[in-house]
């Protein structure tokens, strides 16, 4: 009696399972009573990532550099190519197909994490007590100056902005 | 695929201009689009990019007098206080780090 | 912001020669360097991307080199047509997040 199911890695075609194509292969022929599952490697710039019965393998992605996009990780008959952006750009999703440019965190946020290929800066308000002046896709937000560890005493307070100002001590005649 | 400039013309210092380059065959919100500029019988000068999300980056000498915006189809450049300096041909160019794809550009004149 | 320094501003020579010109940024750029061939009243043509990499439709005569600080843009077996102005332009990313795009002063080349 002809099978309805199949083993893993094998299909039914012609009330008779057959053998998948491995990886990085692409099927030619159904087997038979006679003759077992022809398959044929992947060409150049082509793979297959799992056990399947194509009859096409697929392209290899292309990390178009005119949208700032670079191999990371170069194709193989079993895997796709990885694509990156170039630094200062990130990828817009997961798929990574096209990049943007690298925010920075403005006057009174710092860096939280800085951005990478795949992810943009995350800026973080500075809380009190910290300050960033300046727009940066690095700096962190920096602490208020300690005037007292410096003799002195606070003559303008600090801001999310500004650093406090310290000035002397008033002494008593 | 293609880029055009226009809204160049002979100006008097001072007055502000927008030039706008209109492009076709693909689209602005997957590619970054530069200006750049060229001085008559002087060198490229890069004057700032805009991104797919409209962010825009600048040429430290260019912040504060030149503004790069975009719609669907079209990225303007916006200048103010133009000087006879600014006299050259301004080029709209397609690319993130390189440009592959350039309009044949638009001369502005300053001169009083 | 990173300066490009090209060399020599012009060079002279004859038809299916080799012309070599040089290209120094003033910090390590990597590999992010174009190379541009502009004629008379034309926008500049993008034939070179990332140092080495040609350009779609450019001829294998143009050969371009280099890493760091020091590239090279090689012109072999020299035609008529390839007279014109070279530009070497670099992008670089700062790791104080700034941005810098930058053009050679350009290179005149002569074909006898």
């Known amino acids: 009696e002809p099978p309805t199911a199949c083993r893993e890695k094998q299909y039914l075609i012609n009330s008779q399972c057959c053998s998948l194509c491995q990886p990085g292969q692409k099927l030619v022929s159904d087997c038979t009573e006679f003759t077992e599952t022809e398959c044929l490697p992947c060409g150049e710039s082509e793979f297959l990532d799992t056990w399947n019965r194509e009859t096409h393998c697929h392209q290899h992605k292309y990390c178009d550099p005119n949208l700032g996009l670079r191999v990371q990780q170069k194709g193989t008959s079993e895997t796709d190519t990885i694509c990156t952006c170039e630094e200062g750009w990130h990828c817009t999703s997961e798929a990574c197909e096209s990049c943007v440019l690298h925010r920075s965190c403005s006057p009174g946020f710092g860096v939280k994490q800085i951005a990478t290929g795949v992810s943009d800066t995350i800026c973080e308000p500075c809380p009190v007590g910290f300050f960033s002046n300046v727009s940066s896709a690095f700096e962190k937000c920096h602490p208020w100056t300690s005037c007292e560890t410096k003799d002195l005493v606070v003559q303008q307070a600090g801001t999310n902005k500004t650093d406090v100002v310290c000035g002397p001590q008033d002494r008593l005649r | 695929q293609s880029v055009e400039e226009s809204g160049g013309r002979l100006v008097t210092p001072g007055t502000p201009l927008t030039l706008t380059c209109t492009v076709s065959?693909?689209?602005?919100?997957?590619?970054?689009m530069s200006w750049v500029r060229q001085a008559p019988g002087k060198g490229l000068e890069w004057i700032g990019i805009i991104d797919g999300s409209s962010f825009t980056v600048y040429a430290n000498w260019a912040k504060g007098r030149f503004t790069i915006s975009k719609t669907s189809t079209t990225v303007d450049l916006k200048m103010t206080s133009l000087t006879a300096s600014d006299t050259a041909t301004y080029f709209c160019?397609?690319?993130?780090?390189?440009?592959?794809?350039w309009g044949p550009g638009t001369l502005v004149t300053v001169s009083s | 912001d990173v300066v490009m320094t090209q060399t020599p501003a012009s060079v002279s020579a004859a038809v299916g020669g080799t012309v070599t010109i040089k290209c120094q940024a003033s910090q390590s750029i990597s590999g992010v360097l174009a190379w541009y061939q502009q004629k008379p009243g034309q926008p500049p043509k993008l034939l070179i991307y990332r140092a080495a990499d040609l350009a779609s439709g450019v001829p294998s005569r143009f050969k371009g080199s280099g890493s760091g600080t020091e590239f090279t843009l090689t012109i072999n077996d020299l035609e008529c047509d390839d007279a014109a102005t070279y530009y070497c332009?670099?992008?670089?990313?700062?790791?104080?997040?700034?941005?810098?795009?930058?053009f050679g002063g350009g290179t005149e080349v002569v074909v006898k």
């Open positions: 065959g693909f689209s602005l919100s997957t590619y970054a």
């Open positions: 332009q670099s992008y670089y990313y700062s790791n104080s997040g700034s941005y810098s795009y930058a």
């Open positions: 160019a397609r690319g993130a780090t390189f440009f592959g794809l």
